[in-house]
């Protein structure tokens, strides 16, 4: 589910004029195609460069993919009467580099936000909570997707990436109730210690295609609700044993862990002996080592003990300049 | 050294099955991914699949699920591919190769002819 | 599944020229790519792993590069020897699928 999906309707799409006089609730927005049958509303690839004023009271589901939005200000979605039917909204695509604090707010029943393909350079702490109470009241979304939502290197903050989502992502303890997030393809190096605990309803979890190295400072433990948790194509060596019982003890997970540099070394040997035993990792006899040379695809659960070694480091007077 | 050798050139008819073997040298069989791949004039390399032999897994390109079967013995270090129906189209050298992320190391191909 | 495209089907070239081989993927492949050669007679070889790593045994002529959806190999100072087909393959996604060969032939 990484995308904002509508019902299926016979009813055909009305694309809309321009037109002088003021919106009627359920007009269509020029640039759009609107169907009320299915609540759907698409204004796609279109060049937008903000959210249309005058979308239809019924809308539930809302495509704004493929524009040049650049900023989501406060209230980008407020109306009055309020958009209470919105649900799914998809902004994937639309050249978006800052989403300011309460951009989603008067949101009520919004329970999809697809923010992905955009280059966020500023994500406000703020986006999701709406304020910048230390609790603030819960956010309504249940899946939140922001995969490749890195900017370019020139286009950074100073502050890591990696600080500046998870900030939006625990800020007034707003997502409490999400049960999906995906923050595939970030370049993520770390997953910042605290975040996790914020969200304790997770399902499912994407974090592959980065290039997360450790999952040493990170706890799974309390996410008891977790059902898929996908590690793909990282840069992970190896998974101590503080993370194989955190994950052993989740009661539903399945842990995807293909395509990462798997270092078959003595310290390998923990996690050989969890993966012989362990009904949590899925496709578990595909995963190989990359390193070092001489173990290059070997197959991590047909390892024992005696081919996991670590070179001894010599004393100083052995060592040789 | 790995060294892998593969069985004969064949010459079936259509309609037939065979089975060509890959028996490997030098390296701990059950170890690693053993893969098999298809070469004809003018459509390169396919990869039909792989077996994990101490355990039996198996992966299939969808293209060949039907067609090719893999075992492996590990007693003796052999890798079995059993390809069936054979037509015209089965015409190709087919190779296994040491597996996993890359292939390391392949054997040197068995000629199979399918002709009436 | 995951296509390799290999744009230049044969290419010819003199002894010592430097040859660059390219390959495209139809999605990004995070650098999971592996090249080989298959010599006239039918023997095949692995030359470079994860884009960039040199198989043992390789001569350092062979170099290798890229990453999103665009790869090459690169052949510094061609000798007789390198005569044959180059493959591209990706092992992102099974099935693990090749590119259609480059020839490389002398001049």
């Known amino acids: 589910t990484s995308s904002a999906s509508s019902s299926s309707s016979s009813a055909p799409f009305l694309a809309s004029a321009a037109s002088a006089q003021p919106p009627l609730p359920d007009q269509c927005p020029a640039l759009c195609e609107c169907s009320e049958a299915a609540r759907t509303v698409k204004c796609v690839n279109r060049n937008l460069t903000e959210v249309p004023t005058d979308l239809p009271l019924y809308v539930r589901n809302l495509f704004l993919t493929g524009n040049q939005l650049a900023v989501l200000p406060a209230g980008a979605f407020a109306r009055r009467p309020p958009l209470a039917e919105l649900a799914a909204l998809n902004l994937s695509g639309s050249r978006l580099d800052e989403v300011r604090g309460g951009a989603f707010e008067h949101l009520p029943s919004l329970r999809q936000l697809d923010l992905s393909h955009n280059p966020l350079a500023y994500l406000s702490p703020f986006a999701f909570s709406g304020s910048n109470a230390s609790i603030s009241a819960p956010s309504p979304l249940v899946e939140l997707i922001l995969n490749h939502i890195v900017p370019p290197d020139d286009k950074r903050q100073n502050r890591s990436f990696e600080g500046m989502v998870a900030a939006a992502l625990v800020a007034g303890r707003a997502l409490q109730g999400l049960h999906l997030l995906e923050l595939a393809s970030n370049h993520f190096l770390y997953l910042p210690r605290d975040v996790l605990a914020q969200l304790p309803s997770l399902r499912y979890l994407d974090l592959s295609n980065n290039s997360l190295v450790s999952l040493t400072y990170v706890s799974f433990r309390n996410l008891t609700h977790l059902e898929s948790l996908h590690l793909e194509d990282n840069a992970l060596k190896v998974l101590h044993n503080g993370t194989l019982a955190e994950l052993q003890g989740l009661p539903h997970v399945r842990v995807f862990l293909d395509n990462n540099p798997w270092v078959c070394d003595c310290h390998m040997a923990d996690m050989v002996t969890w993966l012989k035993q362990t009904g949590v990792v899925q496709g578990k006899d595909r995963l190989t080592c990359a390193f070092p040379e001489k173990m290059r695809n070997r197959v991590l659960l047909e390892l024992n003990s005696a081919d996991l070694d670590c070179d001894p480091i010599l004393p100083p007077s052995l060592q040789t300049s | 050294q790995v060294q892998l050798q593969q069985s004969g050139a064949e010459l079936m008819k259509p309609g037939a099955s065979m089975r060509l073997s890959c028996k490997a040298t030098g390296y701990t069989f059950t170890g690693y991914w053993l893969e098999w791949i298809k070469r004809r004039p003018g459509h390169g390399l396919e990869w039909i699949g792989e077996i994990l032999p101490g355990r039996g897994s198996t992966n299939y390109n969808e293209k060949f699920k039907g067609k090719a079967t893999f075992t492996a013995e590990t007693s003796s270090n052999t890798a079995y591919m059993q390809l069936t129906s054979l037509t015209t189209e089965d015409s190709a050298i087919y190779y296994c190769?040491?597996?996993?992320?890359?292939?390391?190391?392949w054997g040197q191909g068995t000629t199979l002819t399918v002709s009436s | 599944d995951i296509q390799m495209t290999q744009s230049t089907s044969s290419l010819s070239a003199s002894l010592g020229d430097r040859v660059t081989i390219s390959c495209s993927a139809s999605?990004?492949?995070?650098?999971?790519l592996n090249w080989y050669q298959q010599k006239p007679d039918g023997t095949v070889k692995l030359l470079i792993y994860y884009t960039s790593s040199l198989h043992s045994g390789v001569p350092s002529r062979f170099s290798g590069s890229g990453s999103g959806t665009d790869y090459s190999l690169t052949i510094s100072n061609l000798e007789p020897e390198d005569i044959a087909i180059y493959y591209c393959q990706q092992f992102s996604k099974l099935p693990y699928t090749f590119g259609g060969g480059t020839k490389v032939e002398m001049k």
């Open positions: 190769a040491r597996g996993g992320r890359d292939f390391d190391n």
């Open positions: 999605q990004g492949i995070n650098n999971h």
